[in-house]
């Protein structure tokens, strides 16, 4: 028969022969022959391969380096890599999460729109009219100005995006 030029799914062409790929979690030891199946071996401890493959070496699991603020979110298996995330108060600098940085704080005049996670930084937003933030915080939202009226008080000093209004007693001299 004519030697094949293409092979089925989960096969590869080597020396005019279609051989089975190794399943995820296993590496290639030796190509198949007309008489012998492809030789595959399981990946070792702390190694993985996540696809049907003909790799002769497994990949090392990612190391979540605590010196870079990393910790293990999900332990790797022979078929999956380790997933790292950042320690509390830190977030990944990239999608691959190879290092961490401290969550950013929102400056006075800005409030937290979205609290940071292990993989995303704090999202700040400017405090709109009627709201303020007088602290630098990674958690605090913009607070509404105090309503002097509900306390039977009057505004003595207008609020800003960084300060609350100052309420004071009503002017008793006014009729």
């Amino acid at each position: 028969p004519e030697p094949p030029t293409a092979c089925r799914e989960k096969q590869y062409l080597i020396n005019s022969q279609c051989c089975s790929l190794c399943q995820p979690g296993q590496k290639l030891v030796s190509d198949c022959t007309e008489f012998t199946e492809t030789e595959c071996l399981p990946c070792g401890e702390s190694e993985f391969l996540d696809t049907w493959n003909r790799e002769t070496h497994c990949h090392q699991h990612k190391y979540c380096d605590p010196n870079l603020g990393l910790r293990v979110q999900q332990k790797g298996t022979s078929e999956t890599d380790t997933i790292c995330t950042c320690e509390e108060g830190w977030h990944c600098t990239s999608e691959a999460c190879e290092s961490c940085v401290l969550h950013r704080s929102c400056s006075p005049g800005f409030g937290v729109k979205q609290i940071a996670t292990g993989v995303s930084d704090t999202i700040c937003e400017p405090c709109p009219v009627g709201f303020f933030s007088n602290v630098s915080s990674a958690f605090e939202k913009c607070h509404p100005w105090t309503s002097c009226e509900t306390k039977d008080l009057v505004v003595q000093q207008a609020g800003t995006n960084k300060t609350d209004v100052v309420c004071g007693p009503q002017d008793r001299l006014r009729a």
């Epitope: 020396n15 030796s30 190509d31 022959t33 007309e34 008489f35 012998t36 199946e37 030789e39």
Partner: antibody, heavy 117, light 109 residues
């Protein structure tokens, strides 16, 4: 560890039969093709036969075709060589060997077959 | 059928010397599927080199294979006492039959 152990050799008269066995251990026998290779006293290596891992394909050297039959029992991890109509020139040490794309990578220790009247 | 011719038939050398063994094929060996085997008296052959140049597991790096097509060489850079043996080349691409060379005996001078 990976091992092949041949048995069944001995002294036999010309025209008679003998069956050799090769017991495999330490690897997934049912995934590998297997060979018989022989070596006459003081001579070189001569390939005898090969069998596919499922037993579906068999090839023989011209010198044994029609007289020898290679077979296997994967449930017993054993390879066989049925030798009929034996001749003096079949006298040799018979080795079983594992087939890979690296060649014959594992060999048994061999079993001696002597054909003599 | 591919015929493999090995030379020399016997090589007389001293420990520490370099050994060069030749294997010539009557036609090109497909994919360089050529192996070298070592055999000591009373023992089974042992795979040394496959694919013409790749050392098998556990084989010391003083053994090296080279060549392609029809001309192949096994080199032992510095002979150790345990290296004195018979060496066979064998091809495993064009079959049947699988063929072996006649062997080269490396003996102590």
């Amino acid at each position: 560890q990976v091992q092949l152990v041949e048995s069944g050799g001995g002294v036999v008269q010309p025209g008679r039969s003998l069956r050799l066995s090769c017991a495999a251990s330490g690897f997934t026998f049912e995934k590998y093709g297997m060979h018989w290779v022989r070596q006459a006293p003081g001579k070189g290596l001569e390939w005898v036969a090969v069998i596919h891992y499922e037993g579906s394909i068999k090839y023989y050297a011209d010198s044994v075709k029609g007289r020898f039959t290679i077979s296997r029992d994967n449930s017993k991890n054993t390879l066989y060589l049925q030798m009929n109509s034996l001749r003096a020139e079949d006298t040799a040490v018979y080795y079983c060997a594992r087939d890979t794309s690296r060649g014959h990578d594992i060999w048994g220790q061999g079993t001696m077959v002597t054909v003599s009247s | 059928e591919i015929v493999l011719t090995q030379s020399p038939g016997t090589l007389s050398l001293s420990p520490g010397e370099r050994a060069t063994l030749s294997c010539r094929a009557s036609q090109s060996v497909s994919y360089d599927y050529l192996a070298w085997y070592q055999q000591k008296p009373g023992q089974a052959p042992r795979l040394l080199i496959y694919g013409a140049s790749t050392r098998a597991n556990g084989i010391p790096d003083r053994f090296s294979g080279s060549g392609s097509g029809t001309d192949f060489t096994l080199t032992i850079s510095r002979l150790e006492p345990e290296d004195f043996a018979v060496y066979y080349c064998g091809e495993y691409a064009d079959y049947p039959p699988f063929t072996f060379g006649g062997g080269t005996k490396v003996e102590i001078k």
